[in-house]
């Protein structure tokens, strides 16, 4: 039947790909930052928030040196992932004052989800093991009330301006020893 | 039409405060974020500080942070700019900016400037 | 910090000539966060191209950006006289906003 399969075709240049990965985290980071902004103008938070369902930072700035390509990139991957599904749950459960961040929230979520595309794309022409399938994540409850929703809007927009951040140190560094 | 008029510059000594003011009118001041961008004689533009319209959020540069504080007062449609602890090195024109469109943070329209020297 | 380096320094010109300004972007910033601004001695600066390659309002056509990730032009097509000025570029993605040092455009 032919000769095997042979490996996975690598972008003639990864860091072309990787660049453009970047340049999308960077865009991604400033909306992010526009539109915590606006959230705390338009609902003033009382100090930090938390959620529990939230992924943990994955790194601090300093333990950058030590990153692996294909680590950065799947738990990357992963905690955009949960971004994502926690900005669409905060779209269809926040509540009638979230409506106000509209379509601001609507366009950060489908630049989320082209970001996760392209770190998908980036995994596969760098030839990295794609990820298991992920395991349907549990629901998330919806907030105990419109304060609870503001909340937790401040809480996933603060975080995921700082994975975002981390994101962008991390695939610089990484850039550099392609 | 956009205007912004900035007041309050002068001679200070090193050391010394100054409250610069920023009299905005023709547009919506209260949806706009503000900045203060600054230009030593005969140098190039250095951004200064950023406040959304609720003020909710501000940003410094590094060289001013801690000194300088922004603030803003939508009822009057007025920008500030307190500076304390003056040096020579923040000797310039000091101009204020709207942004394009809200929370774009950009540089859209500017005043003419007023010029703060720090000197003995 | 993102520093913006632009090139040259100086560019002397005649009126009816073309003028390619270069701005070096020390990282890999999106398009849309790229500015140019255009002073005249004693005046305020003001938006030129906004987004790389948007004329702001009342701009003339001759003035058109162009570029991407780290390298951005800045081109006015036929020069007149009341064009020469010194002119910045300037990044908004990250947080300190920066500018470039300035190409000052004079007349040959």
């Known amino acids: 039947p032919g000769p095997p399969p042979g490996p996975p075709r690598v972008s003639p240049d990864p860091r072309a790909e990787l660049d453009s990965t970047v340049l999308l985290t960077r865009s991604l980071l400033a909306d992010t930052r526009q539109l915590a902004a606006q959230l705390r103008d338009k609902f003033p938070a009382d100090g930090d928030h938390n959620l529990d369902s939230l992924p943990t930072l994955a790194m601090s700035a300093g333990a950058l040196g030590a990153l692996q390509l294909p680590g950065v990139l799947t738990r990357l991957r992963a905690d955009l992932l949960s971004y994502l599904r926690h900005v669409q749950w905060l779209r269809r459960a926040g509540g009638s004052s979230l409506k106000t961040l509209e379509p601001e929230l609507g366009t950060l979520q489908a630049r989320l989800d082209r970001l996760l595309r392209r770190l998908q794309l980036l995994m596969s022409r760098l030839a990295l093991p794609q990820p298991p399938p992920d395991p349907p994540a549990p629901p998330l409850a919806p907030p105990s009330s419109a304060w609870g929703g503001i909340r937790a809007a401040h809480a996933i927009l603060g975080g995921l301006h700082l994975t975002l951040d981390w994101a962008v140190r991390g695939l610089l560094l990484l850039k550099t020893r392609l | 039409e956009v205007q912004l008029v900035e007041s309050g510059g002068g001679l200070v000594q090193p050391g010394g405060s100054l409250r610069l003011s920023c009299a905005a009118s023709?547009?919506?001041?209260?949806?706009?974020?503000m900045h203060w961008v600054r230009q030593a004689p005969g140098k190039g533009l250095e951004w200064v500080a950023y406040i959304t319209p609720g003020s909710n959020t501000i940003y410094y540069a590094d060289t001013v942070k801690g000194r300088f504080t922004i603030s803003r007062d939508n009822a009057k449609n007025s920008l500030y700019l307190q500076m304390n602890s003056l040096r020579a090195e923040d000797t310039a024109v000091y101009y204020c900016?709207?942004?394009?469109?809200?929370?774009?943070?950009?540089?859209?329209?500017w005043g003419q400037g007023t010029l703060v020297t720090v000197s003995s | 910090e993102i520093v913006l380096t632009q090139s040259p320094a100086t560019l002397s010109l005649s009126p009816g000539e073309r003028a390619t300004l270069s701005c070096s972007v020390s990282d890999l910033i999106p398009s849309q966060y790229l500015h140019w601004y255009q002073q005249k001695p004693g005046q305020a600066p003001r938006l030129l191209i906004y987004?790389?390659?948007n004329r702001a309002s009342g701009i003339p056509a001759r003035f058109s950006g162009s570029g991407s990730g780290t390298d951005f032009t800045l081109t006015i097509s036929s020069l007149e006289p009341e064009d020469f000025a010194v002119y910045y570029c300037?990044?908004?993605?990250?947080?300190?906003?920066?500018f470039g040092q300035g190409t000052k455009l004079e007349i040959k």
């Open positions: 300037q990044q908004g993605v990250d947080v300190p906003f920066t």
């Open positions: 987004r790389t390659s």
């Open positions: 900016a709207r942004e394009y469109s809200s929370y774009d943070e950009g540089f859209a329209y």
């Open positions: 023709g547009f919506t001041f209260s949806s706009f974020g």
